[in-house]
């Protein structure tokens, strides 16, 4: 029996009956065995076929076999009901080998020319399966020359049998207090040859409850307990299961915070699997009772481990733990069934005793000593000498715990000293230097510090003076001895003040004329305002109308008198303002340098002389009465004049204060 070619030789060729294309002889038997490489099959077709026809091809025939299976027995020229001729059919081996047998019997009624056939090896497409047959691969099948391979969808791994896809279904950990888990692909059939492990791991103190829901279908056996596929549930205390079949298992209350669910499947079956809804419970905490004037949020039927509630107080009430304030309060339920902190109180907001108002007082409106939410107090300033700045002095205890004005301010009102009050009533004419009486010049300040000088009180902690009077002390402000509230220069009865800082106008040049001869002294403490100590007003924008030529101003001080000595008693003089050109001309002739009188100066005095300020009066105020406000204001600061005070044809020269209002306001607001 001749052998056909064997792999790895090229597998293709021609077969023919003996003597072809001539007639074949009687009693012939020929056998060909064709072998293809693994993963290949053999294809065979006939180009000529002419054999004796006999019932069931008993006489002459060609038989095609593959392994133990006969693929076809062929005879004749054309097929009949009981006999088959190949015609145009193509034949395929079942595996990689094909046996072809030719046989003729002892006689032929007429000559037959036999057969000619061609064969070739071709790749088997293992991925194509006949209807009803099991697929080659579980998921994806990939054909290639000489073979095939299987692959799996994401979440699966190829089993070692190279065909089944096992689910990658282990290591899932559920940490939420409730959730759902199910067999892979649920509710579609679960995968074969898989071993799934799911863990529920909750915080200590929780207990997991398992409920099987919807449907349950796991391969079972009528006699043996779950021999094929099964579901097991394990806790640190006990094991539940195995479960299989079609009946939903009952609820499982595990009494454990950790649960392991194992699901194992074999290589066969077509079942939909299972679905579990899990919840958890824990020892409940005592029901939180809201404190008076507070409420609990959220409101729940019960509170278990990790549940929390917050307390919110009504408006006007605040969270307090004893004396300690809290902005917020949240308590958390612990595993032992206790709250992690005790309930606070919602106490009515208490703004506390209101701060004392310097130079003022406070009155309880709601009731004596009542300082709680919505209580009202009224601040007022000491009458006559102080006036309230900005607000009306009415404050309410608000929910934030602060006393708040009707304008929403939380700071105290300010009692500002009333300026320009004097006991003196001005006579309309000029008369000689006079002794001042108590309360006539309550703004008068005596400055001692090397020399005697004067100043005027502004507000309750500033003194306005001449730059030349305090120039030597500009770097040693504490050396200035400042006295006020007295008429007698040498009296031991006075109000003492000390300087914190001296501010000399940056445009002043010492020993080079008296332009910008102005300075401010900041006191280290506020002085108490009374009838003997009252600040002078600063000039209003409209003040120029009260300081025209011939308008009367008043200068006061303890400077040299006609006798040539410093005055013991405070003296004053009423003097008219002198025309600026006239004054400039008076100081144009020697010994005065040209330009001695500037636009920052004003002059006052009599052409005939005799009424003037003098050495020792420096820095004092030349004041004018504002007839609209009936308050005195400072128009000038005693600055300089002729060597001989009160000399005829010469005038006292004063710093023109109205030119320095921005400078004064800037210094005071900045410091």
């Amino acid at each position: 029996t001749p052998l056909g070619p064997k792999w790895p030789e090229p597998v293709f060729g021609r077969l023919a009956s003996p003597g072809f294309p001539g007639e074949y002889a009687n009693d012939q038997e020929r056998r060909w065995t064709l072998t293809a490489p693994p993963g290949y099959r053999l294809r065979l077709y006939f180009t000529h076929f002419d054999l004796e026809l006999s019932h069931l091809c008993e006489y002459d025939f060609v038989k095609l076999s593959s392994g133990a299976k006969v693929l076809a027995t062929l005879c004749g020229q054309e097929s009949t009901d009981t006999e088959r001729a190949p015609g145009k059919d193509t034949f395929y081996s079942l595996g990689s080998s094909l046996d072809i047998t030719f046989r003729s019997d002892y006689s032929n009624e007429k000559p037959f020319t036999g057969f000619e056939a061609f064969y070739a090896a071709e790749d088997i497409d293992e991925c194509q399966v006949a209807p009803g047959e099991a697929p080659t691969c579980d998921h994806h099948c990939h054909n290639h020359l000489g073979g095939f391979y299987c692959s799996c969808r994401a979440g699966y791994v190829l089993h070692r049998n190279k065909r089944t896809c096992s689910a990658l279904c282990s290591g899932q950990v559920f940490t939420q207090r409730s959730g759902e888990l199910s067999s892979p692909e649920y509710p579609r059939p679960y995968p074969k040859l898989s071993s799934c492990t799911y863990s529920i791991s909750l915080e200590e103190g929780f207990s997991v409850i398992l409920d099987f829901v919807e449907s349950f279908d796991v391969e079972t056996h009528p006699e043996t307990l779950c021999p094929y596929d099964f579901l097991k549930i394990q806790t640190d205390r006990e094991e539940h299961g195995p479960f299989c079949g079609k009946t939903l298992p009952h609820r499982i209350e595990t009494k454990s915070n950790t649960v392991t669910i194992t699901f194992v499947t074999d290589e066969s079956g077509d079942h939909t699997g299972w679905k579990i809804h899990y919840t958890s419970t824990a020892q409940p905490c005592p029901y939180p009772m809201a404190p008076p004037n507070g409420h609990v949020s959220p409101v729940q039927a019960k509170y278990i481990l990790k549940d929390s509630f917050s307390i919110f107080c009504e408006t006007g009430y605040e969270l307090l733990q004893g004396h300690l304030p809290l902005k917020s309060f949240t308590a958390v339920c612990q595993k032992d069934g206790s709250w992690d902190r005790p309930m606070p109180a919602c106490s009515i907001v208490d703004c506390g005793p209101p701060d004392d108002l310097p130079s003022g007082r406070v009155e309880y409106i709601t009731g004596p000593g009542v300082t709680t939410y919505k209580a009202v107090i009224q601040y007022s300033c000491e009458e006559t000498f102080y006036t309230m700045k900005v607000n009306d002095g009415k404050y309410v205890c608000e929910a934030d715990g602060f006393w708040t004005s009707s304008k929403g301010e939380k700071s105290l009102p300010v009692c500002e000293p009333v300026c320009g009050l004097s006991a003196r009533t001005t006579g309309g004419r000029i008369y000689g230097g006079q002794k001042a009486k108590p309360g006539d010049f309550p703004w008068q300040v005596l400055i001692l510090g090397g020399t005697t000088a004067a100043g005027a009180l502004l507000y309750d902690n500033w003194v306005l003076t001449a730059a030349h009077a305090v120039y030597e002390q500009k770097h040693d402000a504490s050396a200035l001895d400042i006295r006020m509230g007295t008429l007698k220069r040498l009296s031991p009865h006075y109000t003492q003040a000390w300087s914190e800082a001296v501010f000399i106008h940056e445009g002043y040049t010492h020993d080079a004329g008296f332009d910008n001869d102005i300075a401010l002294i900041k006191l280290n403490n506020k002085v108490v305002i009374n009838s003997n100590i009252t600040p002078i007003c600063l000039p209003r924008k409209e003040a120029e109308s009260f300081m025209r030529t011939d308008d009367i101003g008043t200068a006061s001080g303890w400077g040299l008198t006609q006798r040539g000595f410093l005055a013991r008693n405070l003296m004053y003089v009423d003097i008219p303002i002198v025309d600026h050109q006239k004054c400039t001309a008076a100081y144009e002739k020697p010994p005065y340098p040209r330009g001695s009188v500037t636009a920052n100066m004003l002059c006052a005095g009599l052409e005939s002389g005799g009424k003037d300020s003098c050495r020792g009066d420096s820095g004092g105020a030349l004041v004018f009465l504002d007839s609209e406000t009936e308050r005195w204001f400072v128009g000038g600061i005693v600055s300089w004049g002729s060597m001989n005070c009160g000399e005829a044809g010469q005038y006292g020269v004063y710093t023109k204060v109205i030119n320095y209002i921005p400078w004064i306001e800037n210094i005071i607001s900045d410091f």
Epitope: G322, K327, S328, D400
Partner: antibody
Framework: EVQLQESGPGLVKPSQTLSLTCTVS?????????WNWIRQPPGKGLEWIGY???????SYNPSLKSRVTISRDTSKNQFSLKLSSVTAADTAVYYC????????WGQGTTVTVSS | DIQMTQSPSSLSASVGDRVTITCKAS??????VAWYQQKPGKSPKALIY???YRYSGVPSRFSGSGSGTDFTLTISSLQPEDVAEYYC?????????FGQGTKLEIK
């Protein structure tokens, strides 16, 4: 982590004002709680000085109230203590602390009152 | 002011002993009491608040109890590292006040 750190001069002259600052990190002083000053004289127990709350309200020990001011600078997350007219009796380790549910203390700063 | 009186002012005990420190308030402070531990040269460290609530990180051997005027700090099994001064504190009302302290030593 919440941290409190006191800073200020270690030596103050009698009659002057003691000034200390507490810098808080890891928590905003406006978020919640009361921010306290506590002191401990050498070899003695603890004395509460006062607090400033998350809202800026203050509470002082009545025995020190006339001399104490507690303030804050929210932009720097700091609160401060000023104690005026000090005497030798004010010599102590001064601590800043937040008490109750959140409890953290600074490491303390020693202040000596001496001329 | 509310006085907080601690007793004893000092005590000596062996490792493993159960130790109790008491604190008596001069008036009702509800449960607004804290306990502090202070080691030499260190800041106080809070152990207990609201009379019986342990701060996180504080060993479970420390426990507190009481309400009203009588309060107790208990160390169930004394350890060498527990050597310190212990203070009670009330924060029920102004001024907050501390006990005078209890010095705890190991025998």
């Amino acid at each position: 982590e919440v941290q409190l750190q006191e800073s200020g001069p270690g030596l103050v002259k009698p009659s002057q004002t003691l000034s200390l600052t507490c810098t808080v990190s890891g928590y905003s002083i406006t978020s919640d709680y009361a921010w306290n000053w506590i002191r401990q004289p050498p070899g003695k127990g603890l004395e509460w000085i006062g607090y400033i709350s998350y809202s800026g309200r203050t509470s002082y020990n009545p025995s020190l109230k006339s001399r104490v001011t507690i303030s804050r600078d929210t932009s720097k997350n700091q609160f401060s203590l000023k104690l005026s007219s000090v005497t030798a009796a004010d010599t102590a380790v001064y601590y800043c602390a937040v008490l109750y549910a959140l409890d953290y203390w600074g490491q303390g700063t020693t202040v000596t009152v001496s001329s | 002011d509310i006085q907080m009186t601690q007793s004893p002012s000092s005590l000596s005990a062996s490792v493993g002993d159960r130790v109790t420190i008491t604190c008596k308030a001069s008036q009702n402070v509800d449960t607004n009491v804290a306990w502090y531990q202070q080691k030499p040269g260190k800041s106080p460290k809070a152990l207990i608040y609201s009379a019986s609530y342990r701060y996180s990180g504080v060993p479970s051997r420390f426990s507190g109890s009481g309400s009203g005027t009588d309060f107790t700090l208990t160390i169930s099994s004394l350890q060498p590292e527990d050597v310190a001064e212990y203070y009670c504190q009330q924060y029920n009302s102004n001024p907050l006040t501390f006990g005078q302290g209890t010095k705890l030593e190991i025998k």
